[in-house]
């Protein structure tokens, strides 16, 4: 209904007030709900109202504002410390102990985070973003340095509709359009063979507890699994001779083991040169990511940190031991 200069929406009535004409909703059932657009951010709850903007937000601390968009820093609390002697004793022994898997304890001294003691080191958000992996979008953590809020701002993350089929046909040099989507890993770039590569700067260097022959046999599944976590595509790097950079890894016995070694003779059968796994060098190819998303990794630093974050959460499906981002072309080292 018309209300002078003010246009009222469907179901609303015009009311002339002392401060001029106003729209009013006599029955919220008949009016467009202001909550339909999910205006309340950071987990705030939305309540329909009879007057514009037809909603009010009840914000969860530490947020405020009409849409819970404002972060209000709590009174400064001293940073949490890892007080437990238990955790001091368990740190850096190569075993992730959940009781010590906290930011204050450096994720059990890196044991729970692929040896990376602070994956959020470059995150300057006022929020402790490691505590906001909560299945809801926290815009203050939605930056590459803060690991894109664990990709929780992507709307309802779709799952790959034909996951089994797409896994079986991933990176098989045949384009399956039903698999050519972000959630299906863009079919391992099978549908983008004619497009130029778009490589992120740097190399991901990953140690995984699978011998090279097993890893190479399972390479497509491995690359798909990690690519799914990073929302982009990965490939195994080739050396100057064109060989895939997957090398046997002989293991680094933990500090705990080295200590034990000093106090006892080696047991029969303990061999330093036994292959414990593989060291694999990976590149990120964003050629499809940049077309479908603005959440792509320009370099491998944050990608490595995001993998460490997944290790903390226990959501890695492969036995990764460590992840490092290397900026320069690496020499072949073990």
């Amino acid at each position: 209904s018309s209300c002078g200069q003010v246009k009222c929406r469907k179901g609303e009535q015009c009311v002339h007030t002392a401060s001029g004409p106003r729209c009013f909703c006599p029955s919220p059932r008949d009016c467009e709900s202001g909550c339909a657009s999910s205006p309340c951010q950071h987990g705030g709850s939305c309540h329909p109202q009879r007057q514009p903007p037809y909603y009010s937000c009840q914000c969860a601390p530490p947020f405020s504002g009409s849409r819970c968009e404002l972060y209000t820093a709590p009174p400064s609390t001293p940073p949490a410390t890892c007080l437990s002697q238990y955790c001091a004793d368990k740190a850096r022994d190569g075993v992730c102990d959940e009781a010590c898997n906290s930011h204050a304890c450096q994720w059990d001294g890196g044991d729970c985070s692929l040896t990376m003691e602070n994956p959020w080191a470059n995150c300057s958000s006022p929020l402790p973003c490691w505590d906001y992996i909560n299945n809801q979008c926290d815009e203050l953590c939605n930056t590459v340095e803060c690991l894109f809020d664990n990709f929780e701002c992507q709307g309802n993350s779709k799952t790959c509709k034909y996951d089994k089929y797409c896994a079986d046909h991933f990176k098989d040099n045949h384009c399956d359009q039903g698999c050519n989507s972000e959630e299906c890993g863009w079919d391992g770039l099978d549908c983008a063979a004619d497009q130029p590569e778009n490589l992120a700067e740097g190399t991901l260097v990953i140690v995984v507890l699978m011998p090279p022959e097993q890893l190479l046999q399972d390479a497509r599944s491995f690359l798909r699994a990690l690519g799914t976590l990073l929302h982009t595509n990965l490939r195994i790097k080739r050396d100057s001779q064109g060989e895939l950079m997957v090398y046997p890894y002989y293991g680094e016995k933990s500090a705990a083991m080295k200590k034990q070694r000093m106090t006892r003779r080696s047991l029969p059968g303990e061999q330093e040169q036994e292959v414990a796994g593989s060291k694999v060098f990976l590149e990120i190819d964003n050629r499809q990511c940049v077309q479908d998303s603005d959440h792509c990794f320009k370099n491998t630093d944050a990608a490595a940190a995001l993998l460490a974050s997944h290790a903390i959460q226990g959501t890695l499906s492969y036995p990764l031991v460590s992840v490092v981002s290397e900026s320069l072309t690496p020499e072949r080292t073990q």
């Epitope: 022994d93 075993v95 102990d97 507890l209 699978m210 933990s254 705990a256 034990q260």
Partner: antibody, heavy 122, light 107 residues
């Protein structure tokens, strides 16, 4: 098929020693943590010790610390429990069990051996 | 050490009954709790981990719930093969401790 087979149990006098073995097959041995769990006759389960073969890190229950030593030989896919200074209260069936979460000690035990009986008696 | 208290210590039930076993931790263990089933002379078998996730191959009549300090194992319709002893275990912090067990017997 993932399988664990314990051996080495038997009758031993108080103060004596025994070495238990747990032979693993059907999976990458060094990738998964392994625990020993015991059960005294007619009693409940008691966790004894843990090892992560890849890093060699070990954990013990207070009741066995200093007397028992857990170890692993990745070339033989076998975990061991060396038990010294045995006491009557160590009498139990000893099970080895694989942890489901790779390097996470904080994971459930998803595969168990059949157990081996240790009797400590004069 | 974290203490785990299971109740009841034993119960009698009939085939088809709904059975509930509870487990309480002496401190917050988040969801790092497992349930095991053990039959006489056999090794324990993992039923539930992460407080509520069924191990593969475990029938859907077994379910787990809870977080923090209070947990429940429910058998929705008891079957003859379910008569056994059930143990909860926390694996949040070493030493990993078990409840004392609940023996489910035939009424």
């Amino acid at each position: 098929e993932v399988q664990l087979v314990e051996s080495g149990g038997g009758l031993v006098q108080p103060g004596g020693s025994l070495r238990l073995s747990c032979a693993a097959s059907g999976y990458t041995f060094s990738s998964y943590g392994m625990s020993w769990v015991r059960q005294a006759p007619g009693k409940g389960l008691e966790w004894v010790s843990y090892i992560y073969p890849y890093s060699g890190a070990t954990y013990y229950a207070d009741s066995v610390k200093g007397r028992f030593t857990i170890s692993a030989d990745t070339s033989k896919n076998t975990a061991y429990l060396q038990m010294n200074s045995l006491r009557a209260e160590d009498t139990a069936v000893y099970y080895c069990a694989r942890h489901s979460g790779y390097y996470r000690i904080s994971s459930a035990m998803d595969v168990w051996g059949q157990g081996t009986l240790v009797t400590v008696s004069a | 050490d974290i203490q785990m208290t299971q109740s009841p210590s034993s119960l009698s039930a009939s085939v088809g009954d709904r059975v509930t076993i509870t487990c309480r931790a002496s401190q917050n263990i988040k969801r790092f709790l497992a349930w095991y089933q053990q039959k006489p002379g056999k090794a324990p078998k993992l039923l539930i981990y992460g407080a509520s996730t069924r191990e593969s191959g475990v029938p859907s009549r077994f379910s787990g719930s809870g977080s923090g300090t209070d947990f429940t194992l429910t058998i929705s319709s008891l079957q003859p093969e379910d008569f056994a002893t059930y143990y909860c275990q926390q694996y949040y912090r070493s030493p990993h401790t078990f409840g004392q067990g609940t023996k489910v017997e035939i009424k």
